[in-house]
C-alpha cells in the first residue's frame, strides 16, 4: 500500500527574469526513492537518478540547474514558464507518487509565494 | 566471477555501421544500469551511453547521439551498442562497464573491443 | 557539460614517494568523484568512489578527498605496481566525465 505524501510548494509566482525554486518532499514512507522527474506538461525538464545523477534536458540546459536537494531551480523566467510543474518520485517497493506545484511568472514586481500544500 | 566480455569490434568505412555486444556473468544482469565507455588510441576515457536496468530508458554522449543506439536482452544477460554512421573519431577501444550500485562508479570492465573507422 | 582537469598530467616519482593527484571540476558535483587506475592495454579498475570511499580490495595507501570542485587522489607510498595512468570521473551530472589523466611514471 502507497502510505507516502507529496508536500511540495504549491502555488508560487515569481517574476519575469527572476528564478524560482520548484521543491518537493516525500514523506511518512520508508519507500527508496530511485528517480524524480521534473516536468512541465508533458515535457521533461531534467531527472535525478540514484544511480546515475542528474540528467537536465538539452533544451532546458540552459535556464535549469539541480537543487537543491532533488529539488529544481529555473532561472531567467519568460511569461511562457508560467503553468503546472510535476515532480514524480519513482520509488521502490511503492511505486509513484506525484507532485504538483503551479508558477504564474509576472510581468510586475508583485509575486507572493503560495502556502505549501500536500498531495496524497 | 564477474565477468564482461565485449565482441563485435573490427574495421568499418565511414558511413557504416557496426554492433558490439557484451556478455555478462556472475551476477544478476537484469538488475543493473549498464554502461559503455570508449578511449581512443592514445587518449583518456569517454561515457558514450546507458540503459536502464529494464530497458526503458537511455541517456548517451552528445557525441554518438542519433547515430548509437544502446540496447540489452536481460533474458541473454547480453548488452548492445548498434553504431551507425560510423565516422573516423569513433575509433577507439569500446568498454561495457557495470556500476557498484548507488556509488555512481564502475567497478567491473570487459576487455574492450576494438573498433576503427577507416576508409 | 561538466569538465574535469586533472593536474598534473604526468608525475615522475620512486617506489616510497608520496604522490598527490589532484581533480578540479568546472561546476560543483558534490562528492559524486571516482578516481581510476588504468594500465596499459588493460581496462580501468575502480579505487575510489564518493570521492573519499575505498574500493573493496584496494591497498589502503590510496585515499581521496574533496568535494565540490576540488578533489585529490594520494598515494601514500609508491609502490612498482603503481606505476600507471589514473582518471578522475565525476557523477553528479549525466554525462558522466573523465579527467585528462595523470601519468605516474618510473623517476
Known amino acids: 500500500m502507497m502510505t507516502g505524501t507529496i508536500e511540495t510548494t504549491g502555488n508560487i509566482s515569481a517574476e519575469k527574469g527572476g528564478s524560482i525554486i520548484l521543491q518537493c518532499h516525500l514523506s511518512s514512507t520508508t519507500a527508496q526513492v530511485t528517480q524524480v522527474n521534473w516536468e512541465q506538461q508533458d515535457q521533461l525538464l531534467a531527472i535525478c537518478n540514484a544511480d546515475l545523477g542528474w540528467h537536465i534536458s538539452p533544451s532546458f540546459k540552459d535556464r535549469v540547474a539541480p537543487g537543491p536537494g532533488l529539488g529544481l531551480t529555473l532561472q531567467s523566467l519568460t511569461v511562457n514558464d508560467t503553468g503546472e510543474y510535476f515532480c514524480i518520485y519513482h520509488t521502490y517497493p511503492d511505486g509513484t507518487y506525484t507532485g504538483r506545484i503551479f508558477l504564474e511568472v509576472l510581468e510586475s514586481s508583485v509575486a507572493e509565494h503560495g502556502a505549501r500544500f500536500q498531495i496524497p | 566471477e564477474v565477468q564482461l566480455v565485449e565482441s563485435g569490434g573490427g574495421v568499418v568505412q565511414p558511413g557504416r555501421s557496426l554492433r558490439l555486444s557484451c556478455a555478462a556473468s556472475?551476477?544478476?544482469?537484469?538488475?543493473?544500469?549498464m554502461h559503455w565507455v570508449r578511449q581512443a588510441p592514445g587518449k583518456g576515457l569517454e561515457w558514450v551511453a546507458v540503459?536502464?536496468?529494464?530497458?526503458?530508458?537511455?541517456l548517451y554522449a552528445d557525441s554518438v547521439k542519433g547515430r548509437f543506439t544502446i540496447s540489452r536482452d536481460n533474458s541473454k544477460n547480453t548488452l548492445y551498442l548498434q553504431m551507425n554512421s560510423l565516422r573516423a573519431e569513433d575509433t577507439a577501444l569500446y568498454y561495457c562497464?557495470?556500476?557498484?550500485?548507488?556509488?555512481?562508479?564502475?567497478?567491473?570492465w570487459g576487455q574492450g573491443t576494438m573498433v576503427t573507422v577507416s576508409s | 557539460d561538466i569538465q574535469l582537469t586533472q593536474s598534473p598530467s604526468s608525475v615522475s616519482a620512486s617506489v616510497g614517494d608520496r604522490v598527490t593527484i589532484t581533480c578540479r571540476a568546472s561546476q560543483g558535483i558534490s562528492s559524486w568523484l571516482a578516481w581510476y587506475q588504468q594500465k596499459p592495454g588493460k581496462a580501468p579498475k575502480l579505487l575510489i568512489y564518493g570521492a573519499s570511499s575505498l574500493q573493496s580490495g584496494v591497498p589502503s595507501r590510496f585515499s581521496g578527498s574533496g568535494s565540490g570542485t576540488d578533489f585529490t587522489l594520494t598515494i601514500s607510498s609508491l609502490q612498482p605496481e603503481d606505476f600507471a595512468t589514473y582518471y578522475c570521473q565525476q557523477a553528479f551530472y549525466l554525462p558522466w566525465t573523465f579527467g585528462g589523466g595523470t601519468k605516474v611514471e618510473i623517476k
Open positions: 562497464a557495470k556500476p557498484v550500485p548507488k556509488s555512481r562508479a564502475l567497478d567491473v
Open positions: 556472475g551476477f544478476t544482469f537484469g538488475s543493473y544500469y
Open positions: 540503459i536502464w536496468p529494464d530497458g526503458s530508458n537511455k
